[in-house]
Interface confidence: medium
């Protein structure tokens, strides 16, 4: 039975050109992470496995960085950064809890008149 | 569950060359981490060499430039070439691989760096 909960930050925004920290946080269960996936849409971002540590997929290796802990640093932001991101905990014995965060980067003279994204 | 079977251990001269294989069968995943360990005797396991399904590799700072660690998804085996042996990578070499839940190991091979 899967007991566990993933915190995520959520809906955040950025400016473009800057760096955000995408995190998540599983709870609430005592099953053993043994691997997170972040992906983007349906594309594989990185992988941090127990055993075998980190791996960034070669077309973002310029601007992802690993952590803090089994988070994600994006770095060098574009408006195209913008969207769904997942963060995909495989666990022993629970199985797979996946966590959602929206992105959306703005144009620095908008990020900087206090303009926020928000999904009701 | 996935099998792994290592091969290619030996007793080589210091600055010799060998070339590990670790043939996986069984249950797969297309995301997957592959990867070397070492124990030497008396000594912690630990990671030498991994490499993703995307291709990115990882290397511990002691075999960077010595090592190169390698993949062929079609067979479903990882390789570790390891040139410039010296006596200090004497060891028993394990294989891993994850798709994400636990990892599965292989039996070990051994490497003796002697002359």
């Known amino acids: 039975m899967m007991t566990g909960t993933i915190e995520t930050t959520g809906n955040i925004s950025a400016e473009k050109g800057g760096s955000i920290i995408l995190q998540c946080h599983l709870s609430s269960t005592t099953a053993q992470v043994t691997q997170v996936n972040w992906e983007q849409q349906d594309q594989l971002l990185a992988i941090c496995n127990a055993d075998l540590g980190w791996h960034i997929s070669p077309s973002f290796k310029d601007r992802v960085a690993p952590g803090p802990g089994l988070g994600l640093t994006l770095q060098s932001l574009t408006v195209n950064d913008t969207g769904e991101y997942f963060c995909i905990y495989h666990t022993y014995p629970d199985g797979t809890y996946t966590g959602r965060i929206f992105l959306e980067v703005l144009e620095s003279s908008v990020a900087e008149h206090g303009a926020r994204f928000q999904i009701p | 569950e996935v099998q792994l079977v290592e091969s290619g251990g030996g007793l080589v001269q210091p600055g010799g060359s060998l070339r590990l294989s670790c043939a996986a069968s069984?249950?797969?995943?297309?995301?997957?981490?592959m990867g070397w360990f070492r124990q030497a005797p008396g000594k912690e396991r630990e990671l030498v060499a991994s490499?993703?399904?995307?291709?990115?590799?990882y290397y511990a700072d002691s075999v960077k430039g010595r090592f190169t660690i390698s993949a062929d998804n079609s067979k479903n085996t990882a390789y570790l070439q390891m040139n410039s042996l010296k006596p200090e990578d004497t060891a028993v070499y394990y294989c891993a691989r994850s798709g994400g839940f636990l990892s599965d190991w292989g039996q070990g091979t051994l490497v003796t760096v002697s002359s």
């Open positions: 069984g249950r797969t995943f297309s995301n997957y981490v």
């Open positions: 490499i993703s399904s995307f291709g990115s590799t």
